[in-house]
Interface confidence: low
């Protein structure tokens, strides 16, 4: 017989020879990382027809790495379904926890046994340092030194020393998020005041007031015979300017060949009626809405 068969899980005991006599026996053993479970034979004999008697490595089983439980507050996920060497174990932590240690362990061979490539990680709680302090404002829980995952703080602005209040620009509430970072940048407290929006040949239809602070919104419509060039709705933004810019009311062309541009406002336009009584936040009827009431 020529050289005996080779196997994935089993190896020849001793050195192979180029030829074997009829009746000669060879013995196998399980390779490193495999263990033997009887009763299947691990030897074969050179038969008189110069072939080896049937033998297989089915009695050799792969060594397995020890079972690893889910980490507390996390999960261990077996990438390829078994604990045999070559396996990968992936670790993830529950929401609100972060991993201390390696996120993947490999089942490796060391000498004759399968062992994990390292120690299982731990899932520890996500903590944040205190959020930033801001000028002209403060946040809740300012005395707390360490915040847990999803703990939130709310910012507010201090009373302003002058006639105009501080406006809070940005997110008023931020929370401790993943990677131990806050969900948003700290907001800013500053005076934001836009000039009174004057639109000649037009009128305000909402957002009446003497002063226009951050996020104040005003809507306009044009007088009859005029069309709106720009947006019918403007907002006072953090740099104390209107966005979009204050629109203009332009005269509608009477030429029969030109089509009148239409207002950018969609839908029917409400008619303006001055308030019958002086509601708070509305101009007095005799002040009119086109007067510049900006202080």
């Amino acid at each position: 017989c020529e050289a005996p068969p080779t196997f994935e899980a089993m190896e020849l005991i001793g050195k192979p020879k180029p030829y074997y006599r009829v009746g000669e026996r060879v013995d196998y053993k399980c390779k490193k990382g495999y263990f033997y479970i009887p009763p299947l034979a691990t030897h074969t004999i050179c038969d008189r027809n110069h072939t080896w008697l049937p033998v297989s490595d089915e009695g050799c089983y792969r060594e397995m790495c020890p079972h690893i439980r889910d980490p507390l507050n996390g999960e261990a996920i077996l990438a390829n379904g078994s604990y045999e060497f070559g396996a990968e174990l992936h670790f993830i932590c529950n929401e609100g926890y972060y991993l201390i240690g390696k996120d993947i362990l490999y089942c490796e061979l060391k000498d004759t046994v399968a062992i994990w490539s390292g120690k299982p990680p731990l899932c520890e709680k996500i903590l944040c340092t205190p959020p930033p302090k801001i000028k002209n404002g403060k946040h809740t829980f300012s005395e707390v030194e360490v915040f847990e995952y999803l703990d939130a703080v709310t910012y507010s602005c201090d009373p302003a020393p002058g006639p105009d209040p501080f406006s809070l620009i940005g997110e008023s509430m931020i929370y401790c998020g993943n990677n131990s970072t806050w969900s948003h940048a700290a907001p800013e407290c500053k005076v934001v005041k836009c000039r009174f929006p004057v639109v000649e040949n037009g009128k305000q239809i909402s957002g009446f007031g003497k002063k226009f602070y951050y996020k104040a919104t005003v809507m306009f419509e044009c007088d009859k015979g005029y069309y709106l060039n720009g947006s019918d709705k403007i907002v006072c933004e953090s740099n104390s300017t209107w966005d979009p810019p204050v629109p203009k009311c332009l005269k509608v062309s009477t030429s029969p060949t030109t089509k009148s541009p239409t207002s950018s406002a969609s839908g029917p336009r409400p008619t303006y009626k001055p308030p019958v009584s002086n509601y708070p936040g509305y101009p007095k009827p005799d002040e009119g809405i086109l007067n510049n009431l900006d202080d």
Epitope: R69, D70, P71, L72, N73, N94, E95, G96, Y97, I100, G101, G118, K119, L122, C123, E124, K125
Partner: antibody
């Protein structure tokens, strides 16, 4: 205020049972592993049992295995320790504690005295 | 007999530096598991002092620090104060079991 409020301690005869409770206020415990730790009079701390956040995994110290059962009712925000077949050596202050690898919040403790 | 070994007592004068050792084995501290430290003032529940070998939770002064090397760890307290007089416990983990040292009584002279 975040705290763990314990109840259920007292004097009990050997062989009898007792159930301890630990109610959380100011935090929701269903995201956290919870433990019981005990301290015999004048002795050190001894870890007793842990339960995972979802209640699926429970581990016990060898000294209480088969006698004590840890459980939790996340809807009530409460942790329990059912102690059966009590022995004199179980006499201790029992603390509930929150955390994973370490215990970052502890109850005030409840004294269990096993005596005939 | 605790699996983690601590000296039963240590002492120091106010302002001094003291250290408390915690010796484990290759199956706990030496296996890469973190060491945590707890302070127990007389008549009160333990309080987390150091977690993850050397991290301080909120409210713990930076006079307290922890370190770990091989199979042992230590807690250092600098600028000793009268209110530091307490029992100190180290803690670690192995195979589903949480371990405590026997505790060390710190006396401020």
């Amino acid at each position: 205020q975040v705290q763990l409020v314990q109840s259920g301690g007292g004097v009990v005869q050997p062989g009898r049972s007792l159930r301890l409770a630990c109610a959380a206020s100011g935090l929701t415990v269903n995201n956290y592993a919870m433990h019981w730790v005990r301290q015999a009079p004048g002795k050190g701390l001894e870890w007793v049992a842990v339960i995972s956040y979802d209640g699926n995994n429970k581990y016990y110290a060898d000294s209480v295995k088969g006698r004590f059962t840890i459980s939790r009712d996340n809807s009530k925000n409460t942790l329990y320790l059912q102690m059966n077949s009590l022995r004199a050596e179980d006499t201790a202050v029992y603390y509930c504690a929150k955390g994973g690898g370490y215990f970052d919040l502890w109850g005030r403790g409840t004294l269990v005295t096993v005596s005939s | 007999q605790s699996v983690l070994t601590q000296p039963p007592s240590v002492s120091g004068a106010p302002g001094q530096r003291v250290t408390i050792s915690c010796t484990g084995s290759s199956s706990n501290i030496g296996a890469g598991y973190d060491v945590h430290w707890y302070q127990q003032l007389p008549g009160t529940a333990p309080k987390l002092l150091i977690y993850g070998n050397n991290n301080r939770p909120s409210g713990v002064p930076d006079r307290f620090s922890g370190s770990k090397s091989g199979t042992s760890a230590s807690l250092a307290i600098t600028g000793l104060q009268a209110e530091d007089e307490a029992d100190y416990y180290c803690s670690s983990y192995t195979s589903g079991t949480w371990l405590f040292g026997g505790g060390t009584k710190l006396t401020v002279l």
